[in-house]
């Protein structure tokens, strides 16, 4: 049992809405019929989360870009090696939420 | 656009079942009639995500704690510190899945 | 790693105006707020106002009201003190500084801008 | 305007001592305090909030008590690199810093 305290600061600075990392799961139906499994079944990315200080803001992405993975797809006979693209988040923002 | 590709072995490594830092909404009915608002209205610990090699797997905490963090009490007139006590998860594994 | 980079001194005139900055980086500029803080040597710590960039709410000292201006541009995470009608009563340090929502306690601060009014 | 009151202008200590600070609050702020510290020619350092939290990375020999009017800021053991301005901020309604800081000196 943890005896330390997290100050509430570094609770605040943690919680709030910045890029962080995500696991996604990965939808087979993308690859088409050919392929029985992706190796992993999920990735990770940056994404925007976390709480506003107001609850009329919400966290949202003001800038992002692709990123590119490589995933194994398990087809018989043979496995290949196949490219992904996934969107990612460098910077957030809270903005007042639209009506 | 991002031109460069993550190897597949960083893409299994880091999707793989551990610890990972999740955001967890609080609940204000946790806290009673008096309070008015919580802040941070979430907080972030570590527990397991990620996903295991095979469909028959789950990712399971095998190693968890308490932790204990302020949060801020807005209530009229005043506000207060409080503390609220959640699972964190240090280790994880993947088991077979529960029939 | 948190930083507010504040600009450097400013040397002006009586009656005139000037424009202090700061801009804030490692940090989701809209998630914390921006405070303004007087010091003048010998004389402790004045709060000027808070600044908030994620609905652009501010709060002024009524001592400062007419004599302070805050604004901020939230796509250079940069926030601004405009200081109107400078006398030597102005002549002072100013630092910039963030707070958590409701409780404003300073965890970082700008290394301070030097105003010297003098004609 | 709530005023907040620093007694003493100036403290002398030696190395190894305990020396305590106190600040008055000309009404009730509930526990809405935070100390900060601030040497020459440097921005000041969070020290304690919420009266009696200690700021990340501040050592254990600071801490600090008080509710209500009343507030005790404490640095025992004290070292030499804790010479400086010390000052009290109360933000239960609007903010505003004691006025005058407690200096303390060898």
């Known amino acids: 049992h943890q005896k330390k305290v997290v100050p509430w600061i570094d609770v605040y600075a943690r919680a709030t809405c910045q890029p962080r990392e995500v696991v996604v799961p990965l939808s087979m139906e993308l690859m088409g019929n050919v392929v029985k499994q992706l190796v992993p079944s999920c990735v990770t990315v940056q994404r925007c989360g976390g709480c506003c200080p107001d609850d009329g803001l919400e966290c949202v992405p003001t800038g992002q870009h692709q990123v590119r993975m490589q995933i194994l797809m398990i087809q018989y006979p043979s496995s290949q090696l196949g490219e992904m693209s996934l969107e990612e988040h460098s910077q957030c923002e809270c903005r007042p939420k639209k009506k | 656009h991002q031109k460069k590709v993550v190897p597949w072995i960083d893409v299994y490594a880091r999707a793989t079942c551990q610890p990972r830092e999740v955001v967890v909404p609080l609940s204000m009915e946790l806290m009673g009639n008096v309070v008015k608002q919580l802040v941070p209205s979430c907080v972030t610990v570590q527990r397991c995500g990620g996903c295991c090699p095979d469909d028959g797997l789950e990712c399971v905490p095998t190693g968890q704690h308490q932790v204990r963090m302020q949060i801020l009490m807005i209530q009229y007139p005043s506000s207060q510190l409080g503390e609220m006590s959640l699972e964190e998860h240090s280790q994880c594994e993947c088991r077979p899945k529960k029939k | 790693q948190v930083q507010l980079q504040q600009s450097g001194p400013e040397l002006v005139k009586p009656g005139a105006s000037v424009r202090i900055s700061c801009k804030a980086s490692g940090y989701t500029f809209t998630t914390f707020y921006i405070h303004w803080v007087k010091q003048r040597p010998g004389q402790g710590l004045e709060w000027i106002a808070w600044f908030y960039p994620g609905n652009v709410n501010t709060n002024y000292n009524e001592k400062f009201k007419d004599k302070a201006t805050l604004t901020a541009d939230k796509s250079s995470s940069a926030a601004y003190l405009q200081l109107n009608s400078l006398t030597s009563e102005d002549s002072a340090v100013y630092f910039c500084?963030?707070?958590?929502?409701?409780?404003?306690?300073?965890?970082?601060w700008g290394q301070g801008t030097t105003l010297t009014v003098s004609s | 305007d709530i005023v907040m009151t620093q007694s003493h202008k100036f403290m002398s200590t030696s190395v190894g001592d305990r020396v305590s600070i106190t600040c008055k609050a000309s009404q009730d702020v509930g526990s809405a305090v935070a100390w900060y510290q601030q040497k020459p020619g440097q921005s000041p350092k969070l020290l304690i909030y919420?009266?009696?939290t200690r700021h990340t990375g501040v050592p254990d020999r600071f801490t600090g008590s008080g509710s209500g009017t009343d507030f005790t800021f404490t640095i025992s053991n004290v070292q030499s690199e804790d010479l400086a301005d010390y000052f009290c901020?109360?933000?239960?309604?609007?903010?505003?810093f004691g006025a005058g800081a407690t200096k303390l000196e060898l």
């Open positions: 919420w009266a009696s």
């Open positions: 500084t963030r707070s958590p929502y409701y409780g404003y306690v300073f965890d970082f």
């Open positions: 901020q109360q933000y239960s309604s609007s903010l505003t």
